[in-house]
Interface confidence: medium
Amino acid sequence: RGVFRRDAHKSEVAHRFKDLGEENFKALVLIAFAQYLQQCPFEDHVKLVNEVTEFAKTCVADESAENCDKSLHTLFGDKLCTVATLRETYGEMADCCAKQEPERNECFLQHKDDNPNLPRLVRPEVDVMCTAFHDNEETFLKKYLYEIARRHPYFYAPELLFFAKRYKAAFTECCQAADKAACLLPKLDELRDEGKASSAKQRLKCASLQKFGERAFKAWAVARLSQRFPKAEFAEVSKLVTDLTKVHTECCHGDLLECADDRADLAKYICENQDSISSKLKECCEKPLLEKSHCIAEVENDEMPADLPSLAADFVESKDVCKNYAEAKDVFLGMFLYEYARRHPDYSVVLLLRLAKTYETTLEKCCAAADPHECYAKVFDEFKPLVEEPQNLIKQNCELFEQLGEYKFQNALLVRYTKKVPQVSTPTLVEVSRNLGKVGSKCCKHPEAKRMPCAEDYLSVVLNQLCVLHEKTPVSDRVTKCCTESLVNRRPCFSALEVDETYVPKEFNAETFTFHADICTLSEKERQIKKQTALVELVKHKPKATKEQLKAVMDDFAAFVEKCCKADDKETCFAEEGKKLVAASQAALGL
């Protein structure tokens, strides 16, 4: 069954149940419900999922049974709207239930919350987790899906099934190990970090589709797939792009059953046709479905064909450039992007898209000129500064990272970004700057040829986090401008921001800089976050503080925490020494 073929199914719910199987069906419905109703208790969701599953089974038995012909949006929306506490818990989201499909589903989508007010997930003791796993494995794994899905309402659902499979494997193996903690904790840390990264990458795909449209997503996909599969023909890449766009449109739109089903079809197609796609797919294609799809999504770039001719012949020197462009603009631009991307695995996708945009703008102007060829003859020269800008930026920042190490590099970015957009909330600035800072350890170790795609495409993902968090509570016109004007120019837009001279410094509040003995029991990461929170607040109070002033205050702060954590009476130390530190800091910064 092709990704586009839709046989005439009398019952869509029966069709998906049969295609996906009961286990995946139930898991995906749970994810869908948890991503829509993020505050509902676990037990309520399980009850709803069981009801939907029982209904689906009646439709499998008889597709003509009552309500079996209804769309999935109608069935799921009706079910969500039965939740008794909808208005108390979700406020205006309850108004969605007064709407008809498809408006009702659009309404639910608009109420997805990227930063839900949910408690941080605290990891219980290993023995407690293993007991819970053994007592009721099914509930334990459902709880995992529920907790991740409600905190990450755009998590790529079929990929979450893959994470759950790994989560289960970790507990199955480690709960029998001699040292359960040594076995399990590193695996859970890895899943947590990979999960956050996966969530953020998918959030960018959904933002791309929802804020900039299908054309923007397809352009991204053409560039990325052409880098990954440089031996595949344009027609093959185009087919994959069309199918991939459908899969992500479905998942981002809450159509998780269709999305998972179509993703499986796409993996099947790729593996059946790997000889005309890539030589790197063999190992992926030998794996079971969830692993296979994940593996294909992460597969390394194939080798470039050796005999690729110069691009200039077809896209600059040819007499038919304007004729070909006029006949089918997007197809011709797609071919340009494909040809450029397959030759440049060393460029970031966003850079390739900037080049394609420049080429498009040039053709729009020149094909209307008296002498088109004379006008566009030097178009490739316009690419040089666009290529050099990210190259230079990455070089400078990798040098700074190697000089400072990750924590201090994050601090440099915290100061830089707080000065650029001081209106943004402190938790958001800390989270985003910490993630921006991770680009160093993630990408600077790579050779030159891999640095740019690693760094700039990762930065696009992180800056999208800033954009979606800011969109919920907009406080800065500069952030709104960089986030909404151009998807591919977000990073250059933020890089170009200077200190915000219009910002009125925050009033000094001693409470912000009052610390207690509980800081001593925090993990190293949590302690760093506390210190980085204080750093952001300092910059908000004194945006014109120099690096040297801020460094001095932060060094004093680190010494203060270290001293008081070693003291016998920690709380007294924090109270007394804290007052001295605040006074000294105010003096040092002239507050």
Epitope: E233, A235, S238, D275, A328, M335
Partner: nanobody, 119 residues
Framework: EVQLLESGGGLVQPGGSLRLSCAAS????????MAWVRQAPGKGLEWVST???????YYADSVKGRFTISRDNSKNTLYLQMNSLRAEDTAVYYC?????????????WGQGTLVTVSS
């Protein structure tokens, strides 16, 4: 619905010329590579020539220098100019939409046009 319709075949003497045409519809013609494939009486299919979306051309050694493939994207038409024809060029010539080149895969074919080279 994708359709490919060949024309221009016929009887020609050795050393003569013919021009085959293939009218395409039902898809974005300029987005795809197109090819000519032939089948001689009692033989298997033989690839003749391919033209890339942007104009690059590829030929089988047996026809190189004698045949020229071309396309007119504005007319959604593929051509094969055949010069210096030989008896061994006798075959049914099919126009095909290329899905991949490594290895060659074609997802749509025309019904074919017969070329007979004989004195």
């Amino acid at each position: 619905e994708v359709q490919l319709l060949e024309s221009g075949g016929g009887l020609v003497q050795p050393g003569g010329s013919l021009r085959l045409s293939c009218a395409a519809s039902g898809f974005t013609f300029m987005a795809y590579q197109m090819a000519w494939v032939r089948q001689a009486p009692g033989k298997g299919l033989e690839w003749v020539s391919t033209i890339h979306q942007t104009g690059f051309t590829y030929y089988a050694d047996s026809v190189k220098g004698r045949f020229t493939i071309s396309r007119d994207n504005s007319k959604n038409t593929l051509y094969l100019q055949m010069n210096s024809l030989r008896a061994e060029d006798t075959a049914v010539y099919y126009c095909a939409k290329v899905r991949s080149m490594r290895p060659y895969k074609f997802d749509y074919w025309g019904q074919g046009t017969l070329v007979t080279v004989s004195s």
